[in-house]
């Protein structure tokens, strides 16, 4: 472990096409990859009318894009699916939009998934 | 452990499409990216663009924007790398690798364009 | 985004240290620790050497050692053994926000 770092050791797992993709729908994911490697957790979603559907949750590659950061904030201006990731355990529970472009108030408010 | 197979060679005329696949397995597909990289002959390495595997949202390199099409099918852990209106400067191995990190790479497909 | 400049080709004997230099723009290489390094013998996919600057895979022996100074990565190999002659790329991180670019290659020949 390098010090300073959070290490991703396991993350909120979600799966909505779980029946299809033979997974279970919910629980917590143990991260496994190269020992050389970073960890980190993952959450997407979409926004259909201003409902929140999630689409999945889990563990994340080595990617530079989720270094040191501890919340899932996905940043890129109106995606089509929204994606966030972060370092440290289960840190995907909570993720929220932010778009980068924006200069208002952004519309989301930080979301505390409850899976139907 | 970790592998990616690419499908097989293809020779295709100038002018039409041809269409790579890249089947993962060994590892969750959806939880990092696909990248695609070329090689002609006897020439360097060239990044096409990328594909994250969970959301499907992709990045192409300028050159081959409009051109290049990359898709992802997580019910079967396969991305694809389309490449239309093929010209002779196009004969290339085409590679997938995953991750931003290029850590694993699949054993590549040559595309020969051809009339 | 333009590609990385190598030189084309260097030489060593065996036993001894050939260093491959990267040079890139500070939006590139001088801005974030994210160059890899790959080896490719002919006919063969490349095989990462090095990413992240300096961290290197399992697997890879400790001879292979990455580093960077501005705009400038560096490889080093240590202990030239005939097996390392082949191409060496530079390239960076691909995924995100970040567009991926390779160097043209650099040929290593073990004299």
């Known amino acids: 472990a390098i010090l300073g770092r959070s290490e991703t050791q396991e993350c909120i797992f979600y799966n909505a096409n779980w029946e299809r993709d033979r997974t279970n729908r919910t629980g917590v994911e143990s991260c496994y990859g190269d020992k050389d490697k970073r960890r980190h957790c993952f959450a997407t979603w979409k926004n259909i009318s201003g409902s929140i559907e999630i689409v999945k949750q889990g563990c994340w590659l080595d990617d530079i894009n989720c270094y040191d950061r501890t919340d899932c904030i996905e940043k890129k201006d109106s995606p089509e699916v929204y994606f966030c990731c972060c370092e440290g355990s289960m840190c995907n529970e909570r993720f929220s939009y932010f778009p980068e472009m924006e200069v208002t108030q952004p519309t989301s408010n930080p979301v505390t998934p409850k899976p139907p | 452990q970790v592998q990616l197979v690419q499908s097989g060679a293809e020779v295709k005329k100038p002018g039409s499409s041809v269409k790579v696949s890249c089947k993962a397995s060994g590892y969750t597909f959806t939880s990092s990216y696909i990248n695609w990289v070329r090689q002609a002959p006897g020439q360097g390495l060239e990044w096409m663009g990328t594909i994250n595997a969970v959301s499907g949202s992709t990045s192409y390199a300028q050159k081959f924007q409009g051109r290049v099409t990359i898709t992802a099918d997580t019910s079967t852990s396969t991305a694809y790398m389309e490449l239309s209106s093929l010209r002779s400067e196009d004969t290339a191995v085409y590679y997938c690798?995953?991750?931003?990190?290029?850590?694993?790479w699949g054993q590549g497909t040559l595309v020969t364009v051809s009339s | 985004q333009s590609a990385l400049t190598q030189p084309r080709s260097v030489s060593g004997s065996p036993g001894q240290s050939v260093t491959i230099s990267c040079t890139g723009t500070?939006?590139?290489?001088?801005?974030?620790?994210?160059v890899n390094w790959y080896q490719q013998h002919p006919g063969k996919a490349p095989k990462p050497m090095i990413y992240?600057?300096?961290r290197r895979p399992s697997g890879v022996p400790d001879r292979f050692s990455g580093s960077k100074s501005g705009n400038t990565a560096s490889l080093t190999i240590s202990g030239l053994q005939a097996e390392d002659e082949a191409d060496y790329y530079c390239?960076?991180?691909?995924?995100?926000?970040?567009?991926?670019?390779f160097g043209g290659g650099t040929k290593l020949t073990v004299l």
């Open positions: 992240g600057v300096s």
């Open positions: 390239g960076t991180f691909a995924g995100g926000k970040y567009y991926g670019v």
């Open positions: 690798a995953r991750g931003g990190w290029f850590d694993y």
């Open positions: 500070s939006s590139d290489v001088g801005s974030a620790n994210y």
